[in-house]
């Protein structure tokens, strides 16, 4: 066959679908690789061809579109399963071609099983809700295109294993689930089950997402440096190890980049000749507020090092702050015998 632009196996789009449920999978070529859509390609006389490689096989084979009840079908740039079976797992390829042009991409499709509480190996999207916000909604995801707008599906919402009914602050509203004055106890996995009829059959779509309640922007503050502070003085003798922790609290802020760094005499540690190491640790509160600690360490400090300025800096979307550590050289303890001798006028 003539040369074909092969985009390879697109593992970025690891598609997971539930067993025994409908699945509609768009050819990724038009979404991520080509600059034109399916309609344009079709008008230009290009044909979309589908084939697949079964799990643990090397052989590419055509997809059987003649199964009973059209279990697998193609509609424009969409491959349909009505419904999926476990052994549909494999790598699927869509190829767009005519006599002079060819482009193709493969992607993995995994059909997964779920238990009666909707637990499965499915990777779950995470939806963040602000704590104590008035009304926030999540929407049953990825159900567009499965049924026409004239069909009115039934939607049932679950938290974990339990059907959501008479929950005080979680209210099902069709495709939406509303949270009123969210609390941390609203954290968890929420599942919508969408049931709709098609050609005398009943299909179910199961969609699970993880809700994480996070700090509210109304409570957000600029970074707070807990250490270094004015109460602690790092007093060292030359030759000792100098350890200075920089501990910073960051309020949760959606999409904020939290940064902590040290400067020594106004320069980044990488830009100076001192043998300094910096170790960072990060911890999170239940509402995803963040505490970052960067420990600056100089194994054998010199008297020159003890005269330098050590400043901890922190930055978030809320602002930038800095705090200098109080570092000084320890005054040597008086040598007892000499002091005593001088005191008695000995020569």
């Amino acid at each position: 066959s003539e040369r074909c632009d092969d985009w390879g196996l697109d593992t970025m789009r690891q598609i997971q679908v539930f067993e025994d449920e409908p699945a509609r999978i768009k050819c990724p070529l038009f979404e991520h690789f080509l600059k034109f859509n399916y309609s344009t390609a079709h008008s230009a006389g290009l044909t979309l061809i589908w084939y697949w490689t079964r799990q643990d096989r090397d052989l590419e084979e055509p997809i059987n579109f003649r199964l009973p009840e059209n279990r697998i079908s193609k509609e424009k740039d969409v491959l349909w399963f009505r419904p999926t079976l476990l052994n549909d797992t494999g790598n699927y390829t869509c190829m767009l071609r005519n006599t002079t042009y060819c482009s193709k991409v493969a992607f993995p499709l995994e059909v997964v099983q779920k238990d009666s509480c909707f637990n499965s190996p499915m990777k779950l999207p995470v939806h963040k809700l602000y704590i104590e916000y008035g009304i926030q909604r999540i929407t049953c995801p990825n159900v567009d295109g499965y049924f026409p707008s004239s069909v009115k599906p039934t939607i049932t919402w679950y938290m974990g294993c339990y059907k959501i009914q008479n929950f005080n602050n979680v209210i099902p509203e069709g495709m939406n689930l509303s949270f009123l004055i969210a609390l941390i106890s609203n954290n968890g996995n929420y599942t919508c089950v969408v049931t709709y009829p098609e050609n005398g059959r009943t299909f179910h779509l199961t969609r699970t997402l993880t809700v994480k309640v996070v700090g509210s922007p109304k409570n957000a503050v600029p970074p707070v440096i807990h250490s270094p502070n004015d109460h602690v003085v790092y007093e060292k003798e030359p030759g000792e190890e100098l350890l200075i922790p920089c501990t910073v609290y960051f309020s949760f802020l959606m999409d904020s980049r939290n940064e902590v760094w040290w400067t020594i005499d106004g320069k980044k540690p990488d830009d100076i000749t001192i043998d300094v190491t910096i170790n960072e640790s990060i911890s999170h509160s239940r509402t995803e507020d963040e505490t970052r600690t960067q420990i600056l360490s100089i194994k054998k400090v010199t008297s020159e090092d003890l005269k330098r300025s050590y400043v901890c800096h922190a930055r978030s979307a809320k602002g930038e702050v800095a705090k200098a550590a109080k570092v000084k050289q320890k005054v040597p303890a008086p040598r007892y015998t000499v002091e005593l001798a001088c005191g008695f006028g000995a020569t």
Epitope: I131, E132, Y133, G134, I135, N168, N169, L180, I181, L183, I184, S185, K218, N219
Partner: antibody, heavy 118, light 107 residues
Framework: EVQLLESGGGLVQPGGSLRLSCAAS????????MSWVRQAPGKGLEWVSA????????LYADSVKGRFTISRDNSKNTLYLQMNSLRAEDTAVYYC???????????WGQGTLVTVSS | EIVMTQSPATLSVSPGERATLSCRAS??????LAWYQQKPGQAPRLLIY???TRATGIPARFSGSGSGTEFTLTISSLQSEDFAVYYC?????????FGQGTKVEIK
């Protein structure tokens, strides 16, 4: 100093209505969820209703759902409880309280007595 | 809703003695539990939150412990002003619910 001052209580007949107010001072009222809590004579405490700091989210105890409406006016630093279709069992001292997700009700008003009787 | 059960209903203690009040939740409330003190004719006052953190201005003789479903309020040495009714309350789930109260009276 945080202060919460309730008013609007009184004697009302069954089926009647009453509107309670709670004037807040000494803190940024618009930054806090607020609640109403009641206490029937000689009985324990019962949470009645809560409202989010912007006023868009409201929650109610099952015992008052559909009859009571909580609201707030952040420009006036005031919390309200509109009570309709009152019943004898609604007789109680009604407290307004500042509500925090991490500490419960940290400040309370002195309460206002509502008596539902014919 | 989460049911909070306090015991005992009444506790008779002599001044200077130790008082231990219990509170049990019908399901886990993590450490989202508060204790309040109420004296006759007064509004409740927050004593303990987060199951064990004393609120501002609360004397050190008041301490709280527990997590999940079992909680305790301890008053190490009762003063005359401590004789009152004590309520536990969970704020883990809406609706926030209170225990029925424990009355601490002079023996």
């Amino acid at each position: 100093e945080v202060q919460l001052l309730e008013s609007g209580g009184g004697l009302v007949q069954p089926g009647g209505s009453l509107r309670l107010s709670c004037a807040a001072s000494g803190f940024t009222f618009s930054a806090y969820t607020m609640s109403w809590v009641r206490q029937a004579p000689g009985k324990g405490l019962e949470w009645v209703s809560a409202i989010s700091y912007e006023g868009d989210g409201t929650l109610y105890a099952d015992s008052v759902k559909g009859r009571f409406t909580i609201s707030r006016d952040n420009s006036k630093n005031t919390l309200y409880l509109q009570m309709n279709s009152l019943r004898a069992e609604d007789t109680a001292v009604y407290y307004c309280a500042r509500s925090l997700y991490w500490s419960g009700f940290d400040y309370w008003g002195q309460g206002t007595l509502v008596t539902v009787s014919s | 809703e989460i049911v909070m059960t306090q015991s005992p209903a009444t506790l008779s203690v002599s001044p200077g003695e130790r008082a231990t009040l219990s509170c049990r939740a019908s399901q886990s409330v993590s450490s989202n539990l508060a204790w309040y003190q109420q004296k006759p004719g007064q509004a409740p006052r927050l004593l303990i939150y987060g199951a064990s953190t004393r609120a501002t201005g609360i004397p050190a003789r008041f301490s709280g412990s527990g997590s999940g479903t079992e909680f305790t309020l301890t008053i190490s040495s009762l003063q005359s002003e401590d004789f009152a009714v004590y309520y536990c309350q969970q704020y883990n789930n809406w609706p926030w619910t209170f225990g029925q109260g424990t009355k601490v009276e002079i023996k």
